[in-house]
């Protein structure tokens, strides 16, 4: 007998063909031998089976000898052997209906686990293979688990259910709730305005929650809360902000914070957390601020950086259009009795300049 796989909620068409291409008597029955549908004259008639309301046939194909049965809004319990009786012959079709659903909400926080559960008819032994948007392959039986969701797991998961050499494909949209970046570093010269942006990696119709930015200044012994805010339908409202520094926050998404000026005492790292309504857990983004200052004091030209820098970063002092350079993998460099001219202080990573500050040294007569 023919095996057909169907998806819960979908429509399936079970075919039944007569040898003669003409309209003739036919019946579809379930395994209990109860009539589902049939033909009476030129009319489609329905029996009292549970499928009566969801079963139909393509009347336009009857005169071609095609007596298919269409079942709408498939349910797992529709899995059965269906019998088509036409021209004194019986054709049996086994329908197996599967459902694949995410155990929880399909909007999950980064780091949370995703479980996909397969609903299947009794007696079936299907196998499931799922492919993430990032190309990760996961196999399983009745359940498939992804222990720690990552940003790149956001998107459409394609799962293939196999049974009796037949396959049916499910597509499940998963949204990983996270910021676009796990961490970002802003490099600024002393006195410059600092812009922190926290774009989300997802969009939601209604986005409501609350957040806070905690800051650990390099010079401070403990961290402190710089700002707390509410998010209501994508509108941002500040609840509380420190007096120093006096941060400003944008009213619309993406979350945007402005620090009026970069000062060494602000250099450090912060953690922005966002708790979304009806979600357990929080979204996190780390943000770092590196501040550079170049000064000349008496016969000493100094360049310093504050904030979280990697040991492989190079700090250099260089006289414009001259070869004279002092360079160190350190947080401060200096030149004694510098030549007159425009000096550049550069913070670079493998030759790529991250931050630069110019200071003019005037000749001393």
């Amino acid at each position: 007998k023919k095996v057909v796989l169907g998806k819960k909620g979908d429509t399936v068409e079970l075919t039944c063909n007569a040898s003669q291409k003409k309209n003739t008597q036919f019946h579809w029955k379930n395994s209990n031998q109860i009539k589902i549908l049939g033909i009476q004259g030129l009319f489609l008639t329905k029996g009292p089976s549970k499928l009566s309301d969801r079963a139909d046939s393509r009347k336009s194909l009857w005169d071609q000898g095609c007596f298919s049965m269409i079942i709408k809004n498939l349910k797992i319990e529709d899995s059965d052997t269906y019998i088509c009786e036409v021209e004194n012959k019986k054709e049996e079709v086994e329908l197996l209906v599967f459902g694949l659903t995410a155990n929880s909400d399909t909007h999950l926080l980064e780091g949370q686990s995703l479980t996909l559960t397969l609903e299947s008819p009794p007696g079936s032994s299907p196998s499931v293979k799922c492919r993430s948007p990032g190309g990760k392959n996961i196999q399983g039986g009745r359940t498939i688990s992804v222990p720690q969701l990552e940003r790149q797991d956001s998107g459409t998961w394609t799962c293939t259910v196999s049974q009796d050499q037949k396959t049916v494909e499910f597509k499940i949209d998963i949204v990983v709730l996270a910021f676009q970046k796990a961490s970002s570093t802003v490099y600024k010269k002393e006195g410059e305005q600092v812009e922190f942006s926290f774009p989300l990696a997802f969009t939601l119709e209604k986005l409501t929650g609350s957040g806070e930015l905690w800051w650990q200044a390099e010079r401070a012994s403990s961290s402190k809360s710089w700002i707390t805010f509410d998010l209501k339908n994508k509108e941002v409202s500040v609840k509380r902000v420190t007096q120093d520094p006096k941060l400003q926050m944008g009213k619309k998404l993406p979350l945007h914070l402005t620090l009026p000026q970069a000062l060494p005492q602000y250099a450090g790292s912060g953690n922005l957390t966002l708790a979304l309504e009806a979600k357990t857990g929080k979204l996190h983004q780390e943000v770092n601020l590196v501040v550079m200052r170049a000064t000349q004091f008496q016969e000493n030209l100094t360049c310093e950086v504050w904030g979280p820098t990697s040991p492989k970063l190079t700090l250099s002092l260089k006289l414009e259009n001259k070869g004279a350079t002092v360079s160190k993998q350190a947080k401060a460099v200096w030149v004694l009795n510098p030549e007159a001219g425009m000096w550049q202080c550069l913070l670079s990573d493998s030759g790529q300049v991250l931050l630069e500050s110019n200071i003019k040294v005037v000749p001393t007569w």
């Epitope: 209990n32 109860i34 009539k35 049939g38 029996g47 009292p48 549970k50 009566s52």
Partner: antibody
Framework: QVQLQESGPGLVKPSETLSLTCTVS????????WSWIRQPAGKGLEWIGR???????NYNPALKSRVTMSVDTSKNQFSLKLSSVTAADTAVYYC??????????????WGQGTTVTVSS | DIQMTQFPSSLSASVGDRVTITCQAS??????LNWYQQKPGKAPKLLIY???NLESGVPSRFSGRGSGTDFTFTISSLQPEDFATFYC?????????FGQGTRLEIK
Amino acid sequence: QVQLQESGPGLVKPSETLSLTCTVSGGSISRYYWSWIRQPAGKGLEWIGRICTSENPNYNPALKSRVTMSVDTSKNQFSLKLSSVTAADTAVYYCARELERLNYYGMDVWGQGTTVTVSS
Amino acid sequence: DIQMTQFPSSLSASVGDRVTITCQASQDISNYLNWYQQKPGKAPKLLIYDASNLESGVPSRFSGRGSGTDFTFTISSLQPEDFATFYCQQYDTLPITFGQGTRLEIK
């Protein structure tokens, strides 16, 4: 074993809505179709329609425009509403379970029936 | 809708008699036919399903035959408790329809 009990007002005014409830005891209301059948005094049986928790109801076309059926799984009850009643709707109303198994389809369990009179 | 016509509409018989009731469908209903018994003031009771199968707990003196459009219901030897009204019911096509009934009285 499963038992059915109809309840509702015995007297309904013409043009009003007849409302009846059938309570299922001794078994679950899920998985089965539940029917309403009526019988005017001294006459035959007329199938009004049927309902199931997981499917749309099926109504007798002769009454379809006036009939509404619903199920309340939490109370293990199903109900019938028949609008714009006339004296012709005076009858004994029965609720019954429709059972399907191999080569079998029948109303195997019935309520004892409730008499509804339409009169002003 | 499928019309179900029963013959006779009423009949008188004595205890021990063999009684046959017929039911005719307005179109082919295969063997999708049930027979019910209803006693005064009581709900109907299913006796025969699928035209010829005896419901469990129903005495074997009751039997049914037929297929297509013509069906018969027989009581081989009438017992005092058998006097009632009998209905045929088709379940080939929705709406489910009943015959008008046959009243069996004591002669």
